[in-house]
Interface confidence: low
């Protein structure tokens, strides 16, 4: 499965958009893990609404957001106040029972150095900024310049 | 100003290795990906790789992957070209470019080193 | 990979007139959830690397002269130079920036009738 680089500046929020088959995976719960090593298991950050019908409301655990939007085949994930320490890879996953299918690999990437004036505001960022099939980012500012890495076919 | 400049290009037999740098001013280097684009003399533009602003992730084109490493010195707002195993076909001026900033453009690049050559013969 | 295939190989244009290139991509870089084109265009002077000047296919870069424009979606793509200049005469390729790996178009050579 393809894997999406996401960069995002430490301190800002990182919103990252997985979208999926609405009818594939009608009725099925979303989640966001972080998978520990290459070939290690995938650590459960935080899942939508135990009741599918209610998986558009935020849920939250601590500085990780998510809400599914059903109808649009599209939940999201918010990262907010990013940090060193959330850089590493994450999956986006269907529930099915026991069973979680990998709809997106995303590979976070925390910068920590704030961009000079000169290179703010040369490119425009708009609010809901995406990136790339399977994968979105929004960043809390528009002065961001970081290029997404899409995904490999 | 964006500056890009390239060295480290020259003549190699086949087999052979072959470093290229590209020195990087005028904008804050750790904060962009970059990448390495060739042309053969003659031909058209080829990508050859691409390296995220951390160095955390990278990217190959198959006519290069496990042959070329692509890396970098943000202290030194340097990238690195190692080209090991090298080929006739590796012939080519290869070009250190900036990925335009912004995360919903993609990887377009913008601006573009004057280029190295580098001749892959015996 | 995305195919990227260019027409004509090479085209001649009088000084004025209008100067088209074709560019087909083998799948979509139409990015739904934006609806945009990861399409970009480049001039190659003789001599000179490369420079940018159209991404998201019809999004020219600052500082290009709006005589070049583009145009198109989905697999099929058009860059207009419409009053060519002698400063326009160059290798013209084009570019998906949609998905890696990155792959250009032939190029299309450009010169004065």
């Known amino acids: 499965l393809n894997t999406t680089v996401l960069q995002g500046m430490a301190g800002q929020s990182l919103r990252v958009s997985c979208t999926y088959d609405a009818l594939k995976h009608w009725g099925r719960r979303k989640a966001w893990c972080r998978q520990l090593g290459e070939e290690g298991p995938c650590q459960r950050v935080v899942s939508t609404h135990g009741v599918w019908l209610l998986a558009f409301l935020k849920k939250r655990n601590g500085s990780t957001v998510i809400a599914d939007d059903t109808l649009a085949g599209t939940v999201t994930i918010t990262l907010k106040n990013l940090q060193a320490g959330d850089a590493g890879l994450y999956q986006c996953q269907s529930l099915r029972g026991r069973e979680a299918e990998v709809l997106q690999k995303v590979l976070v990437e925390v910068l920590e150095d704030p961009l000079d004036d000169q290179d703010a505001g040369d490119l425009w960022v708009p609010e809901e900024s995406s990136s790339f099939e399977g994968a979105q980012v929004e960043h809390s500012t528009s002065r961001n310049q970081e290029t997404s890495f899409p995904p490999t076919s | 100003e964006v500056q890009l400049l390239e060295s480290g290009g020259g003549l190699v037999q086949p087999g052979g290795s072959l470093r290229l740098s590209c020195a990087a001013s005028?904008?804050?280097?750790?904060?962009?990906?970059m990448s390495w684009v060739r042309q053969a003399p003659g031909k058209g533009l080829e990508w050859v790789s691409a390296i995220s602003g951390s160095g955390g992730s990278t990217y190959y084109a198959d006519s290069v992957k496990g042959r070329f490493t692509i890396s970098r010195d943000n202290s030194k707002n340097t990238l690195y070209l190692q080209m090991n195993s090298l080929r006739a076909e590796d012939t080519a001026v290869y070009y250190c470019a900036k990925l335009r900033g912004g995360y919903e453009v993609g990887p377009t690049f913008d601006p573009w080193g004057q280029g190295t050559l580098v001749t892959v013969s015996s | 990979d995305i195919v990227m295939t260019q027409s004509p190989d090479s085209l001649a244009v009088s000084l004025g007139e209008r100067a088209t290139i074709n560019c087909k991509s083998s799948?979509?870089?139409?990015?739904?959830?934006?609806?945009?084109?990861?399409l970009a265009w480049y001039q190659q002077k003789p001599g000179q690397p490369p420079k940018l000047l159209i991404y998201w296919a019809s999004t020219r870069e600052s500082g290009v002269p709006d005589r070049f424009s583009g145009s198109g979606s989905g697999t099929d793509f058009t860059l207009t130079i419409s009053s060519l200049q002698a400063e326009d005469v160059a290798v013209y390729y084009c570019?998906?920036?949609?998905?890696?790996?990155?792959?250009f178009g032939g190029g299309t050579k450009v010169e004065i009738k």
């Open positions: 005028g904008f804050t280097f750790s904060n962009y990906a």
């Open positions: 799948q979509s870089v139409l990015y739904s959830s934006n609806n945009k084109n990861y």
């Open positions: 570019q998906q920036h949609y998905i890696w790996p990155i792959t």
